[in-house]
């Protein structure tokens, strides 16, 4: 694809960061719940 560089866009980066943040929050919540239940 001749315009390959444009796939590394800031909008895509922001989406990826939002997903990472969400997953970290979910996994963190699950971990806290497991510790609480022990």
């Amino acid at each position: 694809h001749s315009d390959g560089i444009f796939t590394d866009s800031y909008s895509r980066y922001r989406k990826q960061m939002a997903v990472k943040k969400y997953l970290a929050a979910v996994l963190g919540k699950r971990y806290k719940q497991r510790v609480k239940n022990k």
Epitope: S2, D3, G4, I5, F6, T7, D8, S9, Y10, S11, Y13
Partner: antibody
Framework: QSVEESGGRLVTPGTPLTLTCTVS????????LSWVRQAPGKGLEWIGI??????SYYASWAKGRFTISKTSSTTVDLKVTSPTTEDTATYFC?????????WGQGTLVTVSS | AQVLTQTPSSVSAAVGGTVTINCQSS????????LSWYQQKPGQPPKFLIY???NLASGVPSRFKGSGSGTQFTLTISDLECDDAATYYC??????????FGGGTEVVVK
């Protein structure tokens, strides 16, 4: 996520020089990484870009004078083939496909006899 | 080769005022919107301000506004603050995986 440049130093004209950009927090296989330079008191000048660690593209004036290559999973090199005094500048590494959203602090290259 | 021409090269305005910086490209940028803006202060790397012509990067105040399409773009800074004193650059991405920077505009805040 960050990028950091290294390798800047004082060189004599004609002595090949290699600068390194080390990335952390993201994969080169999904990123575009550019080299941009700035001569003292001057503006920003785009040198070239490596896309996903594979294909390199250059400004028309930079072809043959510079080579950009991926050297490891976290490093990209810029080789200045035969520096002249005109190549004295701060060299920045920046992530993004034509919109540069992560910048390093830069590394200073001085070419002088 | 594409050329990005920034005007003016220097502009001065009072605190609370407004400045407008123009960026003209010799050919259309990729997708007609692949134009970004940067702020640079002495001794520092450029700071990413605006992407795809009109979108604010994270943490950038809404006083900064980008507009334009194709070959003509504008950065407007309103309610100027002393901290806005810097040099501003536009950058365009072009088909064929080529990028270019404008020559820069120095903003002086009085």
């Amino acid at each position: 996520q960050s990028v950091e440049e290294s390798g800047g130093r004082l060189v004599t004209p004609g002595t090949p020089l290699t600068l390194t950009c080390t990335v952390s927090g993201f994969s080169l296989s999904s990123a575009a990484l550019s080299w941009v330079r700035q001569a003292p008191g001057k503006g920003l000048e785009w040198i070239g870009i490596i896309d996903k660690g594979v294909m390199s593209y250059y400004a028309s004036w930079a072809k043959g004078r510079f080579t950009i290559s991926k050297t490891s999973s976290t490093t990209v090199d810029l080789k200045v083939t035969s520096p002249t005094t005109e190549d004295t500048a701060t060299y920045f590494c920046a992530r993004g496909g034509g919109e540069f959203f992560i910048w390093g602090q830069g590394t200073l290259v001085t070419v002088s006899s | 080769a594409q050329v990005l021409t920034q005007t003016p090269s220097s502009v001065s305005a009072a605190v609370g005022g407004t400045v407008t910086i123009n960026c003209q490209s010799s050919k259309s940028v990729y997708n007609n919107n692949w134009l970004s803006w940067y702020q640079q202060k002495p001794g520092q790397p450029p700071k990413f301000l605006i992407y795809q012509a009109s979108n604010l990067a994270s943490g950038v105040p809404s006083r900064f506004k980008g507009s334009g399409s194709g070959t003509q773009f504008t950065l407007t800074i309103s309610d100027l603050e002393c901290d806005d004193a810097a040099t501003y650059y536009c950058a365009g991405g072009y088909s064929g995986n080529i990028v270019g920077f404008g020559g820069g505009t120095e903003v002086v805040v009085k």
